[in-house]
């Protein structure tokens, strides 16, 4: 008789999740000499321990503490790039500008990027059929709690000038409900962070509006200012040219506004 299984609204665990976490960990620690001491077997065991045999709507930040400890990593606190709804461009940027880091350039972010996972209460099985959806099922699910935990820690570590890339093509350029808006903004430390600089990325070729005047950006400025952190904003009118100029800053066309 097949066991009854809870049916959630979200997609199930990414296929070959354990192998993917292990392989990414091994590769990451090889590439990053400062993480060569990390035992990826222990990392996987800690990752697994955070959600296996636990109800997938009952996950806490505490569950992830052993993993957080193993993945402790020092990134230059003044070289942090946050992003919201524009992950691909942010990652392209840090691939070129190697001294800047998104969360997904750290071990823990790299391990979990684009993956889904959950378990089942009282069984050691991984649920490959379905996992809780943040809206339709519950917010304290393994994936959401993981990203909330690592995002909070990442923001807390930031100092000096922190950059954030925002998607100017969206109706809400700054969304209070995004991870950036709900977690990272509120965990920047005013005693360490002097300025949050927003880069608003334009989508349309002919879009010459000043999106730094957008009401949601003004809302972000207000939240940041109330936290005693300065705010600045730049329009990136041509993201393709922006990336090109990061690659080749000496190019003559890179002196004009991008």
């Amino acid at each position: 008789v097949p066991r009854w299984r809870q049916q959630w609204s979200g997609p199930g665990t990414t296929k070959r999740f354990p192998e993917t976490v292990l392989a990414r960990c091994v590769k990451y620690t090889e590439i990053h000499p400062e993480m060569r001491h990390v035992d990826c077997q222990s990392v996987w065991d800690a990752f697994k321990g955070a959600f296996i045999s636990k109800h997938p709507c009952n996950i806490t930040e505490e569950d992830y503490q052993p993993l957080m400890k193993l993945g402790t990593q020092t990134v230059p606190c003044n070289k942090i790039l946050l992003w919201s709804r524009i992950k691909d461009l942010a990652h392209q940027f840090t691939q070129v500008q190697r001294d800047m880091f998104t969360l997904e350039d750290t071990l823990l972010g790299y391990l979990a990027d684009d993956l889904t996972w959950c378990g089942e209460f009282n069984t050691s099985k991984i649920n490959y059929q379905s996992c809780p959806d943040w809206r339709k099922d519950c917010s304290n699910n393994p994936v959401s709690v993981f990203w909330k935990t690592v995002s909070r820690r990442f923001a807390e570590a930031a100092c000096d000038v922190v950059h954030v890339m925002l998607n100017g093509s969206r109706s809400k350029i700054f969304d209070k409900n995004s991870t950036f808006g709900s977690v990272e903004v509120h965990n920047l430390q005013p005693e360490k962070v002097q300025t949050l600089e927003a880069w608003v990325i334009h989508g349309g070729r002919e879009d010459s509006r000043d999106l730094c005047q957008d009401p949601t950006i003004k809302e972000l400025e207000s939240i940041i200012s109330k936290r005693n952190i300065q705010f600045s904003c730049k329009n990136i009118y041509r993201p393709d040219k922006f990336l090109q100029c990061v690659k080749n800053p000496e190019d003559s066309s890179c002196t004009s506004e991008i």
Partner: antibody
Framework: QVQLVQSGAEVKKPGSSVKVSCKAS????????INWVRQAPGQGLEWMGR????????YYAQKFQGRVTITADESTSTAYMELSSLRSEDTAVYYC??????????WGQGTLVTVSS | EIVMTQSPATLSVSPGERATLSCRAS??????LAWYQQKPGQAPRLLIY???TRATGIPARFSGSGSGTEFTLTISSLQSEDFAVYYC?????????FGQGTKVEIK
Amino acid sequence: QVQLVQSGAEVKKPGSSVKVSCKASGDFFSGYAINWVRQAPGQGLEWMGRIIPLLGDTYYAQKFQGRVTITADESTSTAYMELSSLRSEDTAVYYCARSAAGWFAYWGQGTLVTVSS
Amino acid sequence: EIVMTQSPATLSVSPGERATLSCRASQSVSSNLAWYQQKPGQAPRLLIYGASTRATGIPARFSGSGSGTEFTLTISSLQSEDFAVYYCQQYNNWPWTFGQGTKVEIK
């Protein structure tokens, strides 16, 4: 329980190739690095290279670059090491070793490859 | 590549005595160093990683220390099964490299 079982001893002629297999038991074969380390008679250990099967990602020691090919068959949890243009100095015991970091926690029993005319 | 040099080449010790094996790296390898034991006709066995962490199932008489370029493996009281060849290995820089080994023999 993790076990790595290697293929049997081989005798090869100079200039030929040898392909040694390493079958793994235990979970998540594809996520670990499978390394190849050799040991000439009465000599020390020499790391040759490794593969991460899931990523199809290989890395070879410069000394063996162009002469060694490491592959993996995920369906059978087996890794292979092929060494070409064999010479007498390649006579050695060849070990596969599984790692989840830079150190080697599990080793195969070794395969003796003798290169002789 | 990083050259690992072990000394002495051979160490003669009586059972019950302490054995101290040295390993020197040609440049700093931080604490990214492992020790292995190998007996004749067998594959190496992992003893220590991270310069000082004992691998699963390794007796407490084996201990590792050091960082940077100088490392030591200590066997506090040699048992008959400890007579073997010991290798150090660095995993700080590609390619991973081993020392030439120290043979611990019965005095």
